[in-house]
Interface confidence: medium
């Protein structure tokens, strides 16, 4: 009977050992599967994040395109209206001009003498830029950078005058210290009678033949309304 009990005990031990080994294997398998699942979840999460990011970028890009499209459409609509009208009113800026505070600005990238620059602007139904405020000064300065650039101010006929008739004496000024240093000219026949923005934005008077860059300006018609989209 004792021998019988020992056999049964051995059998039970064997069964228990097998069960333990099997259970361990199953647990290991589950653990591996769990790891795989975790990895898969992580991978899915990062894929989802990437898709959300891409979608967000696409959305931003689309918004920009739509904004640009609307702007282009408005500009086109305005240009067409200008072409169809009698040309006396301007409701929007010409192509490649920059709109700011109900004025349009065009910034040259080459150089001309003051008179040639002045003529260029007139042929565009505009005038050399007339600076009437510190705010406008900063706007122009930002666009031209540190390069000598003509403005619509000269004293070729004696006193300093803005090309559009804006009063010089009471208006905004931003001369460099000691400038203008040739107030009434020096009888050279084209002396230092034309004003330009210097590399730091402040003004200097210079020989009008100098081949500087220039800025044209034209005012949007105050009375006209923005035309509706097509």
């Amino acid at each position: 009977q004792n021998a019988q009990l020992q056999r049964e005990l051995r059998g039970l031990r064997e069964t228990l050992s097998n069960f333990t080994a099997s259970t361990e294997a199953q647990v290991k398998g589950l653990s591996t599967q769990g790891g795989n699942v975790g990895r898969k979840m992580k991978s899915l999460e990062s894929q989802l994040e990437k898709q959300q990011k891409d979608l967000s970028e696409d959305h931003s890009s689309l918004l920009l395109h739509v904004k640009q499209f609307v702007s282009d459409l408005r500009s086109l609509s305005c240009q067409m209206a200008a072409l169809q009208g009698n040309g006396s009113e301007r409701a929007c800026c010409p192509v490649n001009w920059v709109e700011h505070e109900r004025s349009c600005y065009w910034f040259s990238r080459s150089g001309k003498a003051w008179a040639d620059a002045d003529n260029y602007c007139r042929l565009e139904d505009a005038h050399l830029v007339v600076v009437t405020s510190w705010e406008e000064q900063k706007f122009v300065q930002h666009h031209i950078g540190p390069v000598n650039t003509w403005m619509g101010l000269h004293d070729q006929n004696g006193p300093w005058k803005w090309v559009d008739g804006t009063d010089y004496e009471t208006g905004f000024k931003n001369w460099r210290p000691e400038q203008p240093d040739d107030w009434y000219g020096h009888g050279l026949g084209g002396g230092e009678d034309c004003a330009h923005f210097t590399d730091d934005g402040r003004w200097n008077d210079d020989v009008c033949q100098r081949p500087y860059r220039w800025v044209c300006e034209t005012e949007l018609d105050k009375a006209s309304q923005e035309p509706p989209l097509l």
Epitope: R109, S110, G111, A113, V147, N148, L188, G189, G190, G191, E192, D206, V207, Q209, R210, P211, Y212
Partner: antibody, heavy 120, light 107 residues
Framework: QVQLVESGGGVVQPGRSLRLSCVAS????????MHWVRQAPGKGLEWVAV????????NYADSVKGRFTISRDNSKNTLYLQMNSLRAEDTAVYYC?????????????WGQGTTVTVSS | DIQMTQSPSSLSASVGDRVTITCRAS??????LAWFQQKPGKAPKSLIY???SLQSGVPSKFSGSRSGTDFSLTISSLQPEDFATYYC?????????FGPGTKVDIK
């Protein structure tokens, strides 16, 4: 130190082309206008062309207009002069020179020159 | 185009002499004038810019002045190394133009 070194000169037949180069070092090339000036044997200085710091404006002497092209590669600190339809009167030492400003203030630094001889 | 004339075309002087070269522009150029020195077989060297400003590294014996469209370069005390050809140049407008040069040689 600030240095300009020209190259590309040589003997060429009338009607042919030549390209001169000028390599700059010791200063921020992209901030300065650049000029080409030439000097025929036994003669004075003759301005040839200017290019602004950013390449946006180019001007030429009437004697080379339509035949010569000035250009620059700011990434390589190099100025070029492409010379086409060369004539005997283009024979000269060609100098590149730096403009102290963006391209309208003359010259402050000169290279040593490269000789171009146009002869059949 | 702006024409530049120089006088004299050549001059002979002795070491220690005070020498003045003049240059005239055919129209107003403000202060936009430079002076260069060139020795045989060498590149020009900048001496003066803006009519009267001394280029850095240039000795103070060189000076420039302007009266209207007339400009002058003065060497206060001529030294052996100063015998060369001197050119004026206007950069008031394109095309940039040079004077024909003044040759300074030993008397």
């Amino acid at each position: 130190q600030v240095q300009l070194v020209e190259s590309g000169g040589g003997v060429v037949q009338p009607g042919r082309s030549l390209r001169l180069s000028c390599v700059a070092s010791g200063f921020t090339f992209s901030s300065h206008g650049m000029h080409w000036v030439r000097q025929a044997p036994g003669k004075g200085l003759e301005w040839v062309a200017v290019i602004w710091y950013d390449g946006s404006n180019k001007n030429y002497a009437d004697s080379v207009k339509g035949r010569f092209t000035i250009s620059r590669d700011n990434s390589k600190n190099t100025l070029y002069l492409q010379m086409n339809s060369l004539r005997a009167e283009d024979t000269a030492v060609y100098y590149c020179a730096r403009d102290p400003s963006v391209g309208y203030d003359g010259m402050d630094v000169w290279g040593q020159g490269t000789t171009v001889t146009v002869s059949s | 185009d702006i024409q530049m004339t120089q006088s004299p075309s050549s001059l002979s002087a002795s070491v220690g002499d005070r020498v003045t070269i003049t240059c005239r522009a055919s129209q107003g150029i403000g202060n936009h004038l430079a002076w260069f020195q060139q020795k045989p077989g060498k590149a020009p060297k900048s001496l003066i810019y803006a009519a009267s400003s001394l280029q850095s590294g240039v000795p103070s014996k060189f000076s420039g002045s302007r009266s209207g469209t007339d400009f002058s370069l003065t060497i206060s005390s001529l030294q052996p190394e100063d015998f060369a050809t001197y050119y004026c140049q206007q950069y008031s407008n394109y095309p940039v133009t040079f004077g024909p040069g003044t040759k300074v040689d030993i008397k």
